[in-house]
Amino acid sequence: PEPPTACREKQYLINSQCCSLCQPGQKLVSDCTEFTETECLPCGESEFLDTWNRETHCHQHKYCDPNLGLRVQQKGTSETDTICTCEEGWHCTSEACESCVLHRSCSPGFGVKQIATGVSDTICEPCPVGFFSNVSSAFEKCHPWTSCETKDLVVQQAGTNKTDVVCGPQDRLRA
């Protein structure tokens, strides 16, 4: 028969022959022959391969370095890499999460739109009219101004994006 020029999915071409790729979690020990199947071996402890492959070496699991603020979010298997995340109050500097930085706080006049996670920083938004934030915080949202009317009071000092309104008693008209 004519030697193949292309192989099926999960196969590779070598020596004019289609050999089976090794499944995820296993590495290539020896190519197949006309008579004998590809020989694969499971990856060792702390190693992985996440695709059908012909790799002769497995990849090392990622190390979540505590000195960089990292911790293990999901332990690696023979088929998956370890997933790192950051310690409480910190977040990853990149998608690969190779190091961490402290969550940023939202300054007065800004509130938290989205609280930071292990992989994303705090998202701040300016407090719109009717709302304020008088603290620097990584958790506080913009608070609505106090409604003086519901307390039977009147506005004595207008609120800003950094300060609440100041309410005071209404002036009573004398009879």
């Epitope: 020596n15 020896s30 190519d31 197949c32 022959t33 006309e34 008579f35 004998t36 199947e37 020989e39």
Partner: antibody, heavy 120, light 112 residues
């Protein structure tokens, strides 16, 4: 460790049939090609047949082509040699052997053999 | 078919002395991957054959290093650097380059 145990040999008349079996252990049988090799009394080795790990390829020596058929059952971890129209010159010890693959093409582990005597 | 020949067909050696067996093929056993598809086997008296050398020069696991294989194309040699009493038997070369696989006639090695 790799072990191959042949059975099914015996005395048979010319023109009759016999089926040899080879039970394998100690390795992943379904990943390896397998051979039959024979040796007539006091003679040298003669390669008889080979079958690939998933049965897609099988080859037979010209001397047995059309009479002998190599086959395997991976679920039973067993290799077979169906021998029809036997002749006196088929008298031999029949060995089954594992193919060594890319690092050692050809038989690398052999069984102890089973004797087939074709005589009237 | 590829025809294999061996010489000598019989050899008597003194323990501790070297020995050499030649094997020739009627066609080249060198494959495009750079390997020679030539194996050497030893069949000790009353035993099954055992592989000594694969791919012309690769010693099989457990085989003493006094055995070595060399050669390329059509001419191959098996050398025993210092023969021991346990090395007696018949030595066969076999080509695995193409089917039908074929063996040489064998070389009978005896100890003096």
């Amino acid at each position: 460790q790799v072990q191959l145990v042949e059975s099914g040999g015996g005395v048979v008349q010319p023109g009759r049939s016999l089926r040899l079996s080879c039970a394998a252990s100690g390795f992943t049988f379904s990943s390896y090609g397998m051979h039959w090799v024979r040796q007539a009394p006091g003679k040298g080795l003669e390669w008889v047949a080979v079958i690939s790990y998933e049965e897609s390829n099988r080859y037979h020596a010209d001397s047995v082509k059309g009479r002998f058929t190599i086959s395997r059952d991976n679920s039973k971890i067993t290799l077979y040699l169906q021998m029809n129209s036997l002749r006196t010159e088929d008298t031999a010890v029949y060995y089954c052997a594992r193919d060594g693959g890319i690092a050692a093409p050809g038989p690398d582990y052999w069984g102890q053999g089973t004797l087939v005597t074709v005589s009237s | 078919d590829i025809v294999m020949t061996q010489s000598p067909l019989s050899l008597t050696v003194t323990p501790g002395e070297p020995a050499s067996i030649s094997c020739r093929s009627s066609q080249s056993l060198l494959y495009s991957n750079g390997y020679n598809y030539l194996d050497w086997y030893l069949q000790k008296p009353g035993q099954s054959p055992q592989v000594l050398i694969s791919l012309g020069s690769n010693r099989a696991s457990g085989v003493p290093d006094r055995f070595s294989g060399s050669g390329s194309g059509t001419d191959f040699t098996l050398k025993i650097s210092r023969v021991e009493a346990e090395d007696v038997g018949v030595y066969y070369c076999m080509q695995a380059r193409q089917t039908p696989f074929t063996f040489g006639p064998g070389t009978k090695v005896d100890i003096r």
